[in-house]
Interface confidence: low
């Protein structure tokens, strides 16, 4: 039979510049001598020779003189390879090939890693900052491997994913320098943290910057939004209302208005330096420019999609600033259910039938209720599934298994919990023939 060669399944992780041991072992039979052993280490993909032992002696390294065996341990079945001064270019799979009378081989992966430096943070602009200003924060970390994962968060630990641009460049040794840029609208003050993670070492390098903009002595701007979520039908336009009270002598040149996604801080729309800067949100947003001077900072969101659902922050800065968040709840009505019956002919009392109620393209997920002709709820033997399509709209299929009586009507009600809209379907079974109600 084949010789059993064992290597670790998990990659061997080695830091750049250190030595790594690629473990490989076999079980020598009684009476085994090294003269019988043929041991070859090679690169799995290219079959390039790395190191070999043959004819009773170590044939040496064929890999930049940076490999060695453990000669004193070979007789006990230890065929491990020592790789010195590990480089990024060493990363990959190595095959340990052992031949005595029979042969066997196994591949072990080398994962190279290098820790990232503590990030340095820079701010642009870095003086005369006021609430409502847009600043660019750059986080830089050096000489790591493999490519880093970069995370930004605010002082409360909330992730900031909008308006982040991250670039990673490898140097001649293959080590990466990472630069991540966050564009953010300043609040009253704020801490912004950058975390650079080495995904292999699970090593996190942190830095943060706290920005305290200059404030004027006047009170904060009172920004008002509706407390209840704004409900909008998919495909229609929605208005996210936001208002502030302009002081006497107020002019639009003084106004900084920013709409952004509350969670990610992604910019949606802005008005600065006396003019509308336009939509940063798929060109589906607009302000009400004629009403801005009266304090109406509302946002029009066109052709609403399921993906728009969530919280939007209206941020107003004049001399001082204020902000408030409004929730958008997206909805779509469910279609009138279609009813199918299986089996659908030669039905007799006592037969078990499967009634399927299907309703399409609603949002959010529906509540489904079944009842008999007397309005009594039917809860046993009901299976309901809801599947979202690419637009995020749900198709609902509810299946009722029931034992037929002499005759009966079975009704299905599909309710949209946001719109409180009910869509009904029913089927009446009267032995033979069976009748369906006409479509409404």
């Amino acid at each position: 039979g084949a010789l059993e060669v064992q290597v670790p399944e998990d990659p061997v992780v080695a830091l750049v510049g250190t030595d790594a041991t690629l473990c490989c072992s076999f079980s020598p039979e009684p009476g085994f001598s090294l003269a019988q052993l043929n041991l070859i280490w090679q690169l799995t993909d290219t079959k390039q020779l790395v190191h070999s032992f043959a004819e009773g002696q170590d044939q040496g390294s064929a890999y930049a003189n940076r490999t060695a065996l453990f000669p004193d341990l070979l007789a006990q079945g230890n065929a491990s390879l020592r790789l010195q001064r590990v480089r990024v270019a060493d990363e990959g799979s190595f095959t340990c090939f052992v031949s005595i009378r029979d042969f066997g081989s196994a591949a072990v992966s080398l994962q190279v890693a290098a820790p990232y430096s503590k990030p340095s943070m820079t701010l642009e602009p870095n003086k005369d900052l006021r609430p409502g200003d847009t600043v660019t924060i750059t986080c830089s970390s050096y000489q790591g491997y493999p490519e880093a994962e970069v995370f930004w968060q605010d002082g409360q630990g909330v992730p900031l994913t909008g308006n982040v641009t991250t670039s990673q460049m490898a140097n001649e040794q293959g080590l990466f320098d990472v630069h991540s840029i966050l564009r953010v609208v300043l609040g009253a003050n704020g801490t912004y943290s950058c975390l650079v993670r080495n995904p292999v070492l699970q090593q996190d390098a942190h830095s943060s910057v706290t920005i305290t903009p200059q404030r004027s002595p006047t009170g904060a701007v009172e920004v008002q939004v509706p407390e209840d979520p704004v409900v909008a039908l998919v495909g229609t336009d929605a208005t996210l209302r936001c208002s502030f009270s302009p002081e006497p002598g107020f002019s639009l040149a003084q106004l900084n208005l920013i709409w952004q996604l509350t969670d990610t801080k992604q910019l949606v729309h802005s008005f600065t330096e006396g003019r509308d800067q336009g939509s940063a949100y798929a060109n589906r947003t607009a302000l009400f420019p004629d009403l801005l001077a009266q304090g109406n900072a509302s946002l029009r969101l066109q052709r609403v999609r399921v993906a728009d659902e969530g919280s939007f922050t209206c941020f107003v800065s004049i001399r001082d600033f204020g902000s408030a968040a409004v929730s958008l709840q997206v909805a779509a009505p469910y279609s009138k259910p279609s009813m199918t019956l299986e089996p659908n002919k030669d039905l007799r009392p006592g037969d078990t039938v499967t009634i399927t109620c299907s309703s399409y393209r609603g949002y959010p997920e529906a509540e489904v209720f079944w009842q008999d002709g007397q309005g009594v709820p039917l809860t046993g033997n009901v299976t309901t599934s809801q599947m979202a399509n690419e637009q995020g709209l749900f198709d609902v299929h509810s299946v009722l298994r029931v034992v037929l009586g002499a005759n009966g009507t079975y009704s299905c009600l599909v309710r949209n919990p946001v719109l409180q809209q009910d869509a009904h379907g029913s089927v009446t079974i009267t032995g033979q023939p069976m009748t369906f109600p006409p479509e409404a």
Partner: antibody, heavy 116, light 110 residues
């Protein structure tokens, strides 16, 4: 011969804690990733957590994140699962398995029952 | 609901060939190798197929695995009564950063 022996299961009240152990033998424990997999009564398999050979990298299912902690002591050839804030839905047989990506050996499991 | 989809049941008569499917997505089966496990009644699961189609020593060659795109299949030929068990597919999901199993398929030998 590879052997994995789980222990530490039992009856615990909701909100309580348990620590499961898995004693490994028959292979070089420190060279292999390890995992915990559970199976609720009459249900399918659910991966719970995995850990790299050295113990530095750990992964968790969303359902246990923040409540369960996987660890290992390579000097004792033992894998652990610390389970806090236990819920009724954590009731299951917990298996320890060798490797992280293909579970080539499994223990016989230890039953954890969370009930008041 | 499982990330990987398997039929809940399958059946066949002795000597027949049965196939069990496992459907996933690009983040799991599409980018990682699939493993199959067999769980006989009242016992711990056992590795049956790894790396899509490889059999560990001791597993009969009646069991075979294959993969195409985001789906995998386990085929059992020459069905025997001792094959009656639950079969699970599994793989790593890169999006979830987690190992995922199929819901399991109960194989009945009629």
């Amino acid at each position: 011969e590879v052997q994995l022996l789980e222990s530490g299961g039992g009856l615990v009240q909701p909100g309580g804690s348990l620590r499961l152990s898995c004693a490994a033998s028959g292979f070089t424990f420190s060279s292999y990733g390890m995992s915990w997999v559970r199976q609720a009564p009459g249900k399918g398999l659910e991966w719970v957590s995995g850990i790299y050979s050295g113990g530095s990298s750990k992964y968790y299912a969303d359902s246990v994140k923040g409540r369960f902690t996987i660890s290992r002591d390579n000097s004792k050839n033992t894998l652990y699962l610390q389970m806090n804030s236990l819920r009724a839905e954590d009731t299951a047989v917990y298996y320890c398995a060798k490797n992280r990506l293909r579970f080539d050996y499994w223990g016989q499991g230890t039953l954890v029952t969370v009930s008041s | 609901q499982s990330v990987l989809t398997q039929p809940p049941s399958a059946s066949g008569t002795p000597g027949q060939r049965v196939t069990i499917s496992c459907t996933g997505s690009s983040s799991n089966i599409g980018s990682n190798s699939v493993t199959w496990y067999q769980q006989l009644p009242g016992t711990a699961p056992k590795l049956l197929i790894y790396s899509d189609s490889h059999r560990p020593s001791g597993v009969p060659d009646r069991f075979s695995g294959s993969k195409s795109g985001t789906s995998a299949s386990l085929a059992i030929s020459g069905l025997r009564s001792e094959d009656e068990a639950d079969y699970y597919c599994g793989t790593w999901d890169a999006s979830l950063n987690a190992y995922v199993f199929g819901g399991g398929t109960k194989l009945t030998v009629l």
